[in-house]
Amino acid sequence: EQAPGTAPCSRGSSWSADLDKCMDCASCRARPHSEFCLGCAAAPPAPFRL
């Protein structure tokens, strides 16, 4: 759920207070500790392989 006063994000994205915009939940695979990932429906399905 969005914080009051923030624009709703489309499906597959979540609001980033740090960046002040909607961010892709898909990016949580590479950066799972991003604060907006808490707003994504599911945990990233696989670790980012280096």
Epitope: D18, D24, A26, P45, L50
Partner: antibody, heavy 119, light 111 residues
Framework: EVKLQQSGGGLVQPGGSMKLSCVAS????????MNWVRQSPEQGLEWIAE??????????HYAESVKGRFTISRDDSKNSVYLQMNNLRPEDTGIYYC??????????WGQGTTLTVSS | DTVLTQSPASLVVSLGQRATISCRAS??????????IHWYQQKPGQPPKFLIK???NRDSGVPARFSGSGSGTDFTLNIHPVEEDDTAIYYC?????????FGAGTKLELQ
């Protein structure tokens, strides 16, 4: 408006050195992974280096073709990223772009700067 | 490294017709939720311009004429109807692992 302004490049002899710079504006620089991508007729678009975030002690990654010769660095206080290139080879000739990505795709690119390695 | 193979290398399409560009990965670049393939457009003398992320999501400002699809190893960029301004080289890129690699590009020309 996001802008990545590049400087550096030019003609250098084989074995020589060159430093490229890129100054960013219009986005929260310190949150983004910064990259260098080069382009040549022979190799096409080739990712060559990435530097990540201060929170992780600025980890870096390099393409095998430049490992040990190129060094990427950044200065978040100046919104800048750099590429120090040593022991340059003719095959390093190309257009060099700085590009940013949060995690996956390169959403903004610099205008490009040309490096020619030739005697 | 994950190799991306684009086809065709070049494509000539009439105004208003459909252009279809393929990108095949040497291994799967998809999870159950997302595909880690992205598309770019490059015009002469310019840097690549980001078009589509995660196989099918257009960047803001990219016309709906551009669409992406696919999962696993096979991905497609469609442009329909093609306009004159679409003359360019199109590249796919993966972000499955380090190094992120690009396809060799597909040159789109108008008849």
């Amino acid at each position: 408006e996001v802008k990545l302004q590049q400087s550096g490049g030019g003609l250098v002899q084989p074995g020589g050195s060159m430093k490229l710079s890129c100054v960013a504006s219009g986005f929260t620089f310190s949150y983004y992974w910064m990259n260098w991508v080069r382009q040549s007729p022979e190799q096409g678009l080739e990712w060559i280096a990435e530097i990540r975030l201060q929170s992780n002690d600025y980890p870096t990654h390099y393409a095998e073709s430049v490992k040990g010769r190129f060094t990427i660095s950044r200065d978040d206080s100046k919104n800048s990223v750099y590429l120090q290139m040593n022991n340059l080879r003719p095959e390093d000739t190309g257009i060099y772009y700085c590009a940013c990505r949060y995690a996956d795709y390169f959403d903004h690119w610099g205008q490009g700067t040309t490096l020619t390695v030739s005697s | 490294d994950t190799v991306l193979t684009q086809s065709p290398a070049s494509l000539v399409v009439s105004l208003g017709q459909r252009a279809t560009i393929s990108c095949r990965a040497s291994q799967s670049v998809s999870t159950s939720d997302y595909s880690y393939i992205h598309w770019y457009q490059q015009k002469p003398g310019q840097p690549p311009k980001f078009l589509i992320k995660y196989a099918s999501n257009r960047d803001s400002g990219v016309p709906a004429r551009f669409s992406g699809s696919g999962s696993g190893t096979d991905f497609t960029l469609n442009i329909h109807p093609v306009e004159e301004d679409d003359t360019a080289i199109y590249y796919c890129q993966h972000s499955w692992e380090i190094p992120p690699t690009f396809g060799a590009g597909t040159k789109l020309e108008l008849q």
